[in-house]
Interface confidence: medium
């Protein structure tokens, strides 16, 4: 017996042929003896059965001996033993019919689960295996998840139902959302600008949700909300924004933010989160803000860093072109009674140079300078 | 941690065949394709096929159809590539890469001379 | 078969400065789900190639966040904030959206 695999929703074309190439008469029926279709000379006749309206047959075929039966718009329970009679024979055709589902919208978000189920005739045992447009691959039987998705997991899958030696394919397209970066870190000198920028890792035409940045600064015993937003097409719309810091915020995509002016009480973590148009769960994007002050205060130079570094970050004094003075993997170190000249104080990682502010000692007798 | 390693250089004459082994480590074999890209000398890099472990399906650029054949053994966590009927052009670094288009991890790469 | 085109082939950079490739797809690797099929690799001499930006803008892990990748469709870029001495080797960009995949030619990035 032949078997024939068929993909819910498709159109399939069982053949019969007649050892005469001319037309003969031929019928069609299912393992029910039920008819389905038959010719009459060169006219199609059709049975009783529940395929009516989806069954047919190519009369440009029949003059070849060639009498396929072709089924539309398939559905599962169209899987039978088929049975073409003609010239006193019989071919019979197993059909089975398959589905593929996803169990939600395939617009998913970065780290959540995707499960496929396999909808299959009763009596079957086929196996799937899905693979990624990146060569990622998972197998199952009736259903398969693919957790944790990431970024890369975005694109057509390709899902191949495997059953009495027959391959089926359905393809499936899986869109992952997500931020470009999970984290960055700002560096910044007291009182300069900041810019926060959030940039989304896919490109739609139309996105719509709403978003807020939460705050933790490291001064502070607790976080709190800085600016709540709307997205409607693309277009921003702060809702609400605390008085201080003041922040600013771009009307268009990506999301950027502007804080005025980097102060140590500023310096902490922020976690931006934008919850999409019908989409369970929430993007997150982790900010940090590191912030550097240099200051002279009578006999002692100082310089700090406020803000989230890692311990392997250095952070020295030096007069310029010269020797670091003191070079501590410490968030504050100082010299006392400095000589005059420009200072610089550098935080750096493995020798790059990741913040610097420089600072103006004079001679005793005259106050210090802040370029 | 994910490791490719990959078989020793190669020296072969004019028609003869070579296969390269490529090991993989760190993580299940049969989840990721692997790749074979290669490299002529001073030359750019170069898709020749892909197969996937979990089946050992192959696809194959139709520059080197019906000249390479990729296979793989599940128990020892091994892909191999053969290229058959060598030719002077085919002396290049031979890498293999895990994934079908895009390729986060690389084997070192074999070096195969064909020279009579 | 899509051909990816890169410029300049040869780039002579200084340490500190910034320094910029570009890759030009032949068809757009603009998949329908908003996604750039573009990759960026380095090979430093002497290795294997490491992938650095994949589906057009988003950095592998583990690579330093001086490199970014952006473009869409057809034109994309590959910049480096500030070159490093351990930055030198050739980059290629390939297409991830169609099997085969194909790289560029290779831009070797030298200090000057």
């Known amino acids: 017996k032949k078997v024939v695999l068929g993909k819910k929703g498709d159109t399939v074309e069982l053949t019969c042929t007649a050892s005469q190439k001319k037309s003969i008469q031929f019928h069609w029926k299912n393992s029910n003896q039920i008819k389905i279709l038959g010719n009459q000379g060169s006219f199609l006749t059709k049975g009783p059965s529940k395929l009516n309206d989806r069954a047919d047959s190519r009369r440009s075929l029949w003059d070849q001996g060639n009498f396929p039966l072709i089924i539309k718009n398939l559905k599962i329970e169209d899987s039978d033993t088929y049975i073409c009679e003609v010239e006193d024979q019989k071919e019979e055709v197993q059909l089975l019919v398959f589905g593929l589902t996803a169990n939600s919208d395939t617009h998913l978000l970065q780290g959540q689960s995707l499960t496929l189920t396999l909808e299959s005739p009763p009596g079957s045992s086929p196996s799937v295996q899905c693979r990624s447009p990146r060569g990622k691959n998972i197998q199952g039987g009736k259903t398969l998840s693919v957790s944790q998705l990431e970024l890369q997991d975005s694109g057509t899958w390709t899902c191949t139902v495997l059953q009495n030696q027959k391959k089926v394919e359905f393809k499936i397209d899986i869109v992952v959302l997500a931020f470009q970066k999970a984290s960055s870190i700002v560096y910044k000198k007291e009182g300069e600008q900041v810019e926060f920028s959030f940039p989304l890792a896919f490109t739609v035409e139309k996105l719509t949700g709403s978003g807020e940045l939460w705050w933790q600064a490291e001064r502070a015993s607790s976080s709190k909300s800085w600016i709540t937003f709307d997205l409607k097409n693309k277009e921003v719309s702060v809702k609400r924004v605390t008085q201080d810091p003041k922040l600013q915020m771009g009307k268009k995509l990506p999301l950027h933010l502007t804080l005025p002016q980097a102060l140590p009480q500023y310096a902490g973590s922020g976690n931006l989160t934008l919850a999409l148009e019908a989409k369970t769960g929430k993007l997150h994007q982790e900010v940090n803000l590191v912030v550097m002050r240099a200051t002279q205060l009578q006999k002692n130079l100082t310089c700090e860093v406020w803000g989230p570094t890692s311990p392997k970050l250095m952070l020295s004094l030096k007069l310029e072109n010269k020797e670091a003075k003191v070079s501590k993997r410490e968030k504050a170190v100082w010299v006392l009674n400095p000589e005059a000249g420009m200072w610089q104080c550098l935080l750096s990682d493995s020798g790059q140079v990741l913040l610097e502010s420089n600072i103006k000692v004079l001679p005793t007798w005259s106050t210090p300078v802040q370029p | 941690q994910v490791q490719l390693v990959q078989s020793g250089a190669e020296v072969k004459k004019p028609g003869a065949s070579v296969k390269v082994s490529c090991k993989a480590s760190g993580y299940t074999f049969t989840s990721y394709d692997i790749s074979w890209v290669r490299q002529a000398p001073g030359q750019g890099l170069e898709w020749m096929g892909m197969?996937?472990?979990?089946?050992?399906?192959?696809t194959y650029a139709p520059k080197f159809q019906g000249r390479v054949t990729m296979t793989r053994d599940t128990s020892t966590s091994t892909v191999y590539m053969e290229l058959s009927s060598l030719r002077s052009e085919d002396t290049a670094v031979y890498y293999c890469?895990?994934?079908?288009?895009?390729?986060?991890?690389w084997g070192q790469g074999t070096l195969v001379t064909v020279s009579s | 078969d899509i051909v990816m085109t890169q410029s300049p082939l040869s780039l002579p950079v200084t340490p500190g400065e910034p320094a910029s490739i570009s890759c030009r797809s032949s068809?757009?690797?603009?998949?329908?789900?908003?996604?750039?099929?573009l990759d960026w690799y380095l090979q430093k001499p002497g290795q294997s190639p490491q992938l650095l930006i994949y589906?057009?803008?988003n950095r592998a892990s583990g690579v330093p966040d001086r490199f970014s990748g952006s473009g869409s469709g057809t034109d994309f870029t590959l910049k480096i904030s500030r070159v490093e001495a351990e930055d030198v080797g050739v980059y290629y960009c390939m297409q991830a959206l169609q099997t085969p995949p194909s790289f560029g030619q290779g831009t070797k990035v030298e200090i000057k």
């Open positions: 068809q757009s690797l603009l998949h329908s789900n908003g996604y750039n099929y």
């Open positions: 890469a895990r994934g079908a288009v895009g390729f986060d991890y």
């Open positions: 197969i996937s472990p979990s089946d050992g399906s192959t």
């Open positions: 589906l057009g803008s």
